[in-house]
């Protein structure tokens, strides 16, 4: 779970820790700002009561009337109904509609191969040190080691297919066992949770949208990791995922089947291949101990080249080291053999950008990286745009009610599981479960798909994906059939196992009461969004990796005590929470800890410090360039500050927001003025000379 | 055109040693391995061993091994193969024999062989 | 160190007969088998190398075949010149090893 936001006192509790709760009028509070006052403001003071804190997230004690952030956004159509169009309108009106779909498509087209070249500059960035991840032979005798190279690997490459096409390929050659490739199958698992989570983080521009984003992306992420905490352990103990596919595996006789359709693959490889195109057998090669391999680039520059066989004459130290008995001879000092040697002729350079820079790796990943992220970053605003026009009113209710809307009574229940299909169904056309929960983040942010109808869909995506894992194993050459498709079924099986352990009962929809905790804090403190990130996606697994690397003993040496205590505070939350007269007096809340181990303000301050000079100076630049671009278009109403700017502006005015507790996991209630929202509406005036 | 020209006919006595010379010409001396092979009076032939006059590599037939010493001097081209501990069953005539396929131990050019005859 | 037995030790034929010499080796030598021909009085001289290649100069009736333990050099057509005696040798192994030697005569 996410670090604690903060810890309120435990109920009941004789020694009560009031705090002001300022600038809480009945009255609706003025929306185009945020009103957070610091607690020494002569504004009028609620004594508030600090209660037992659930979850990860940080309330504000507001009026009886909330609004729960979690609700859907209406979105109001201001413009003209169509009946009330006259012909030249609605023609207008259509082709407006027509133009937007077009516009939609297309950004959702770049989205897309934008999210394909981020994976090559990944690869291209981290490729080579993920191979050598996989060299290490502590993974065979180590788990927990082969979890976190699953979860680094994916990370790097930023994609699950390639880190488990390097495990299957290695199985296949003997050098990993299907049971030592099961936890790093569950790491990957984990990995590729971080593509969506990163598209969420474009989203942070308005709050309630980045709630909402970020929590339907790391729904995924919870998922993936509470599986693995409860199923690794277990199959460890019983090597049930191993068992099971063994079986099956070996009781159906497999014909090599075709090759799992690539459906999107198709549209957005001709433009994506035009970027860069990489040789992805150098990240295998590398894994499997290829010493010439590391020397070699993953930037492709021969797409065609003629492979000609050849035998030649080579020395060996002995007669044992000969190819065969029979191809073997001695010139009367040195033993000789034949070998069959592959020489390459290389006839055709690729057609991409980067093909006669000779960059290093590390150099084009880096442009890439940077320019991925732009174009997925723009794209996603400009999605969030136009879907934000087209769904308003009558149109946002169809779709919303389409989507989120339950099955009839007694048929409710299946309604998840519907979304569950879909979400498979949807990442096997897509061929891509991070593409699919990427497509899948702004629509929970702009509130088109509830967290509660996201989670069977993400669930759906992670089965999605390791089908199209199995199609692809079944039309793998005979000697990695059994390993590919044992692997893939292992894949599968894990994916079943979690959702058979965190969805059917809604009590154990744990993920969902996580995200939506993680949600609340990344929307109060924005930062943590990218802290939480480094830290599940690259420090514990780095962590755990130099641990693993120094010996079972320093590991569980470090190990135990570190799990013992997130033990202990969960307990100690739990019966704070539950039954807090059990507990002696000064355990009933969490004061006894100092405040930087309870809170995450004063983090937000050291933060904010670190960030604030950057801040200024990305503002004053943001406003020069602004005001440059205004004085172009002869348009002096567009010149406003950008979001970062009014945040910065508004925490420069030193109001702060008085905290609350939540009473429950569920429920959660925060108001959207008291955490600094602003209706985008509001903050931007269009240009219209533009 | 390749020769190999060795040393005159020996006459030694039992427990002596005997040292051939073999003189190249016509080719790269280095490039080309040289072997020692022996053949007894209406005897088959039996190959002694070789050198690599490049690096001076050698490989010896293990029944003349401790007995056999081969060697070579660049700068006259020349390859010696000296035979200590002499026996009567030594009695033989030893040729040189180059071989110019390269890698395979097929000797094609031969040098005129060297009597070496050891009585008491 | 792998023997090499040739057969028959010794032959007589026509002129203009086809003559077969076989050689045996004690284990798999592949296809690293050479021949030899030596007249009475002179240095050997490489007819055959490889089981089947010809070497430079030498005469189209002289063949080679075989590989793994057995091999064969034949004289389609025998010559008064071809007197001499005939040796197979493997160069599979170290040390590099001869047949006993095939005589051949005319009649």
């Known amino acids: 779970m996410a670090p604690w936001p903060e810890l309120g006192d435990a109920q009941p509790n004789p020694d009560k820790y009031l705090e002001g709760a300022a600038g809480q009028q009945p009255t609706a509070p003025d929306k185009s700002k945020e009103t957070n006052k610091t607690d020494n403001t002569e504004a009028p003071v609620t004594k508030i009561e600090l209660l037992p804190s659930y979850s990860t997230a940080t309330l504000i004690d507001e009026p009886t009337e909330v609004d729960d952030p979690w609700n859907l956004p209406t979105l109001q159509d201001s413009g003209i109904k169509w009946s009330e169009r006259d012909t030249k309108g609605k023609i207008l009106c259509f082709f407006q509609g027509i133009g937007r779909l077009i516009l939609l498509l297309g950004f959702l087209y770049f989205f897309v191969c934008s999210l394909d070249i981020l994976s090559s500059a990944f690869q291209l960035v981290g490729g080579k040190m993920a191979g050598q991840f996989f060299s290490n032979s502590s993974i065979m005798s180590n788990p927990l080691l082969g979890l976190v190279i699953g979860v680094l690997v994916t990370v790097l490459v930023q994609s699950s297919s390639t880190s488990t096409s390097i495990v299957v390929s290695m199985v296949s050659s003997s050098l990993l066992t299907v049971r030592a490739a099961i936890p790093i199958i569950m790491g990957a698992n984990i990995g590729t949770s971080i593509t969506n989570t990163i598209v969420a983080l474009m989203q942070v521009g308005d709050r309630s949208e980045f709630r909402r984003a970020f929590a339907g992306a790391t729904v995924h992420d919870f998922f993936n990791w509470l599986s693995v905490l409860v199923l690794l352990p277990v199959e460890v103990a019983t090597h049930y995922l191993e068992i099971i596919t063994q079986l099956i595996v070996e009781s159906f006789h497999f014909k090599n089947g075709e090759d799992a359709p690539d459906l999107l693959k198709v549209i957005t490889k001709p433009f994506t291949k035009l970027i860069v195109q990489l040789d992805k057998k150098v990240i295998s090669q590398i894994a499997m101990n290829d010493e010439k391999a590391k020397n070699k680039s993953l930037v492709k520059i021969w797409c065609k080249t003629f492979t000609n066989k050849t035998q030649i004459n080579v020395t060996v130290p002995s007669t044992a080291n000969c190819t065969s008995p029979s191809l073997c001879w001695t010139d009367g000092i040195q033993n000789w053999t034949m070998k069959n040697v592959t020489y390459k002729e290389n006839i055709a350079k690729c057609q991409h950008i980067f093909v006669n820079f000779h960059l290093p790796d590390l150099a084009v990943g880096t442009i890439l990286l940077i320019l991925s992220l732009l174009v997925l970053c723009g794209c996603l605003i400009m999605i969030v745009k136009i879907l934000g026009s087209v769904l308003k009113g009558q149109v946002a209710t169809v779709i919303k009610k389409t989507i989120n809307t339950d099955f009839p009574f007694p048929f409710a229940w299946l309604t998840g599981y519907l979304a569950i299909l879909v979400g498979a169904g949807m990442t096997f056309i897509v061929q891509s479960s991070s593409v699919f929960t990427s497509a899948l983040t702004p629509l929970i942010g702009i509130g088109v798909i509830t967290i509660e109808r996201a989670y069977p869909l993400t669930l759906g995506s992670n089965i999605g994906t390791t089908t199209t894992a199995i199609l692809a194993a079944l039309a793998s050459p005979g000697n990695a059939l059994r390993s590919s498709l044992q692997i893939a079924l292992c894949h599968f099986f894990f994916n079943i196992s979690g959702i058979l352990l965190w969805y059917p009962i809604p009590f154990t929809r744990l993920p969902i009461r996580m995200a939506k905790g993680l949600g609340n804090i990344s929307a109060k403190y924005r930062w943590f969004a990218v802290f939480y990130l480094i830290i599940f996606f690259f420090l514990i697994p780095l962590t755990v990796f130099g641990l693993s690397l120094a010996g079972w003993r320093v590991l569980v040496g470090v190990g135990v005590p570190v799990v013992f205590i997130i033990i202990l505070v969960l307990c100690l939350r739990l019966l704070q929470s539950r039954c807090p007269r059990v507990l002696p007096k000064k355990l009933q809340n969490w004061n006894f800890l100092p405040l930087w181990m309870r809170s995450l303000k004063p983090w937000d301050a050291v933060v904010s410090k670190f960030t604030g000079c950057f801040q200024m100076r990305c503002c004053c630049c943001c406003r020069v360039c602004c005001r440059a671009c205004c004085l172009l278009c002869d348009c002096p109403k567009c010149c406003r500050c950008s979001k970062c700017c009014e945040d910065l502006e508004e925490a420069q005015e030193g109001q702060d927001v008085p905290v609350k507790a939540p009473e429950t996991f569920d429920n959660i209630t925060i108001s959207r003025e008291a955490q600094g929202e602003v209706p985008a509406s509001d903050s931007k005036t269009e240009c219209t000379a533009l | 055109q390749v020769q190999l020209v060795q040393s005159g006919a020996e006459v030694k006595k039992p427990g002596a040693s005997v040292k051939v010379s073999c003189k190249a010409s016509?080719?790269?001396?280095?490039?080309?391995?040289m072997h020692w092979v022996r053949q007894a009076p209406g005897q088959g032939l039996e190959w002694m061993g070789a050198?690599?006059?490049?690096?001076?590599?050698?490989s010896y037939n293990q029944k003349f091994k401790g007995r056999v010493t081969m060697t070579r001097d660049t700068s006259t081209s020349t390859v010696y193969m000296e035979l200590s501990s002499l026996r009567s069953e030594d009695t033989a005539v030893y040729y040189c024999?180059?071989?110019?396929?390269?890698?395979?131990?097929?000797?094609?050019?031969w040098g005129q062989g060297t009597l070496v005859t050891v009585s008491s | 160190d792998i023997q090499m037995t040739q057969s028959p030790s010794s032959l007589s034929a026509s002129v203009g007969d086809r003559v077969t010499i076989t050689c045996k080796a004690s284990?798999?030598?592949?296809?690293?088998v050479a021949w030899y021909q030596q007249k009475p009085g002179k240095v050997p001289k490489l007819l055959i190398y490889?089981?089947?290649t010809r070497h430079t100069g030498v005469p189209s009736r002289f063949s080679g075949s075989g590989s793994g333990t057995d091999f064969t050099l034949t004289i389609s057509s025998l010559q008064p010149e071809d007197v001499a005696t005939y040796y197979c040798?493997?160069?599979?192994?170290?040390?590099?090893?001869f047949g006993g030697g095939t005589k051949v005569e005319i009649k």
């Open positions: 284990q798999d030598v592949g296809t690293a």
């Open positions: 016509g080719y790269t001396f280095i490039t080309y391995n």
């Open positions: 024999a180059s071989s110019t396929i390269i890698t395979t131990g097929a000797v094609d050019y």
């Open positions: 040798q493997q160069y599979s192994r170290i040390p590099l090893t």
């Open positions: 490889w089981t089947s």
């Open positions: 050198i690599y006059p490049g690096s001076g590599d050698t």
